[in-house]
Amino acid sequence: DAHKSEVAHRFKDLGEENFKALVLIAFAQYLQQCPFEDHVKLVNEVTEFAKTCVADESAENCDKSLHTLFGDKLCTVATLRETYGEMADCCAKQEPERNECFLQHKDDNPNLPRLVRPEVDVMCTAFHDNEETFLKKYLYEIARRHPYFYAPELLFFAKRYKAAFTECCQAADKAACLLPKLDELRDEGKASSAKQRLKCASLQKFGERAFKAWAVARLSQRFPKAEFAEVSKLVTDLTKVHTECCHGDLLECADDRADLAKYICENQDSISSKLKECCEKPLLEKSHCIAEVENDEMPADLPSLAADFVESKDVCKNYAEAKDVFLGMFLYEYARRHPDYSVVLLLRLAKTYETTLEKCCAAADPHECYAKVFDEFKPLVEEPQNLIKQNCELFEQLGEYKFQNALLVRYTKKVPQVSTPTLVEVSRNLGKVGSKCCKHPEAKRMPCAEDYLSVVLNQLCVLHEKTPVSDRVTKCCTESLVNRRPCFSALEVDETYVPKEFNAETFTFHADICTLSEKERQIKKQTALVELVKHKPKATKEQLKAVMDDFAAFVEKCCKADDKETCFAEEGKKLVAASQAALGL
């Protein structure tokens, strides 16, 4: 339905508070380097303009598209060329090319200082002094560091952030109350950002069809009692929501997400029995709850899939009549029967089925040709099952830190050209699959593990795309979205890699390591491990373990010493020499 003024329409639908928050997120995700105050000024100007349009939709410029209005506003920033360089050239373009240009300049790894958490009292004072500014700053800092963060979900995080401060700043022990909550929000936020980044990559790099296939599989697992037509409607609406958010259309996205939550709750009887609690919550909590809702129970007496998709003489006729609908039905039927499979596995099975039909429906005897298609699924199912079994056994044997180290070595040997910070970040996240998923029973392990790995490997892909250094990474990232994990798993040691020159500075440590948190200390050690492998890719597990054990002992010893700095200098030299000898450097 067309509105005379789009900006007025969204302002009225969303309300002033959400409107302002979403515009701030949008601007911070586009202009990631701009100071907070500049963004607040721009948001206030847009909000005032929106109010004039609400008062009179025929007022000047009120009929302009949101992209035009927002783009024009962003292009008024005085320091655009100095701060962003070639991004300033976007402003010479017309819509829709201008918005596409801004999108292309979003930076997944912006050069921004790490967010340092102030003392609790300092935070509580700032919160009480100006709650609105404090919360806006949260939105701004998260949005600029995570330019694809799912905006309506960021509103939910901000609501929880506010609730944490409201509660804890009145508590007897503020820190004990607040810090665990902030840690939880930080970890959940990173996970949410990474999950959304995969959705946007799926849409932007592989197209709407790929995203829709993912959504059919996931929603069919989650809502196995829903009819195919119902799932298809939800998929269409969900695709629109994520296309908008990934395209920077955050007001439309938030509005449509609210409409979708409303529809789901109004029709929960034909969707899922698990939605009741979610649907009793306020809007932001409701949408979040629906997105995370557990899978409904599978209907009893689901018939054999083979009847319609293998044994039926009408397979090729049905396929030819409406290929995507028929494949969608196949994916829906398979997924609702298999909550124990990862979404990416279900998509691989659907792709295999499609390939078989393409070949067989052109054959002399189609039925004879596709009769054994389900047999082709067996190795595809067994591969992730075996991989997860092996890796969970390794995780249980080593624990998270050493499991991460095993993955660090494995991935550095596969793609040694990738930057050390990226290898550390990605391998640490890959290693978290153990504590996240291995505790689950068999039936939940694969969807947990493989779909999580897809999210983490997408981080590698988007970081690598910014500065491509490895053809192997590019190949695994671009060839097939659903085969990324098997592609990386299949990579062996890169025999073409020329070992990095040894640099003693890389292995020089100082007393500041002693004051770091356990996590930061681990990262330092893991950085050293990656560098070791880059110097000596052929080093054995045993050699690397010996060096790392020596390194851990060295850090422990020097952190206990009276003169820490001297200890690090002297013992450090010895350690480097011993390590070089041990590795034959």
């Epitope: 007496d301 018939p303 899939l305 009847a307 319609d308 044994e311 039926s312 003489k313 006729k317 039905m329």
Partner: antibody, heavy 121, light 110 residues
Framework: EVQLVESGGGRVQPGGSLRLSCAAS????????MGWVRQAPGKCLEYIGI???????YYASWAKGRFTISRDNSKNTVYLQMNSLRAEDTATYFC???????????????WGQGTQVTVSS | IQMTQSPSSLSASVGDRVTITCQSS????????LSWYQQKPGQPPKLLIY???DLASGVPSRFSGSGSGTDFTLTISSLQPEDFATYYC???????????FGCGTKLTVL
């Protein structure tokens, strides 16, 4: 006892609609394709269409557009929705269980007793 | 698609061997997707033969079917009193939309 029972038949005016039901007992409908066949008084059997276990529907060319087959596995029932009825649709309507699950083999091994539909003004 | 049965009616005596034929205007699916039914007045049809020659459960062995492609035969080796009825053939074709019945052969006592 394994059986199919049709219901919903009766007299209807030309241009009217009727929804026939076929309730299964003693077995689950979800394991076989279910078809509808009709027989005008003293005439041949006439295939109307079939619904597969997964809900794919197939209709005789003359039935397409006016007749719709659906199923509700939770109720163990199959339906035949008939619209724009004409005098020549007067017949006994049978539901039947096909040997196959995903298509029509023409081999219906379990039949209901039928329900009479009369279209007249 | 047409299914033509012949004869349309037939009189015979108990103990006789009876043959009914069915011809389709195009080949049935897999050359064998043809069924035979028996129907008595006021009753639904009863499946006798499927896949051209396979005997349905509970059907006496005096009934047999043969044929392939477009031409099929139902044979009753030795007529029994309960066999007097109308017999229909039905063919399954490459599309489930095309399933078709013949118009029947009425078997009466001579």
């Amino acid at each position: 006892e394994v059986q199919l029972v049709e219901s919903g038949g009766g007299r209807v005016q030309p241009g009217g609609s009727l929804r026939l039901s076929c309730a299964a007992s003693g077995f689950s409908l979800s394991s076989n394709a279910m078809g509808w066949v009709r027989q005008a008084p003293g005439k041949c059997l006439e295939y109307i269409g079939i619904i597969s276990v997964g809900g794919f529907t197939y209709y005789a060319s003359w039935a397409k557009g006016r007749f719709t087959i659906s199923r509700d596995n939770s109720k163990n029932t199959v339906y035949l929705q008939m619209n724009s009825l004409r005098a020549e649709d007067t017949a006994t309507y049978f539901c039947a269980r096909d040997r196959h699950g995903g298509d029509s083999s023409g081999a219906f091994y379990l039949w209901g007793q039928g329900t009479q539909v009369t279209v007249s003004s | 698609i047409q299914m033509t049965q012949s004869p349309s009616s037939l009189s015979a005596s108990v103990g006789d061997r009876v043959t009914i034929t069915c011809q389709s205007s195009e080949s049935v699916y897999s050359n064998n997707q043809l069924s035979w039914y028996q129907q008595k007045p006021g009753q639904p049809p009863k499946l006798l033969i499927y896949d051209a020659s396979d005997l349905a459960s509970g059907v006496p062995s005096r009934f047999s079917g043969s044929g392939s492609g477009t031409d099929f035969t139902l044979t009753i080796s030795s007529l029994q009193p309960e066999d007097f009825a109308t017999y229909y053939c039905a063919g399954g074709f490459s599309s489930s939309s095309d399933t078709a019945f013949g118009c029947g052969t009425k078997l009466t006592v001579l």
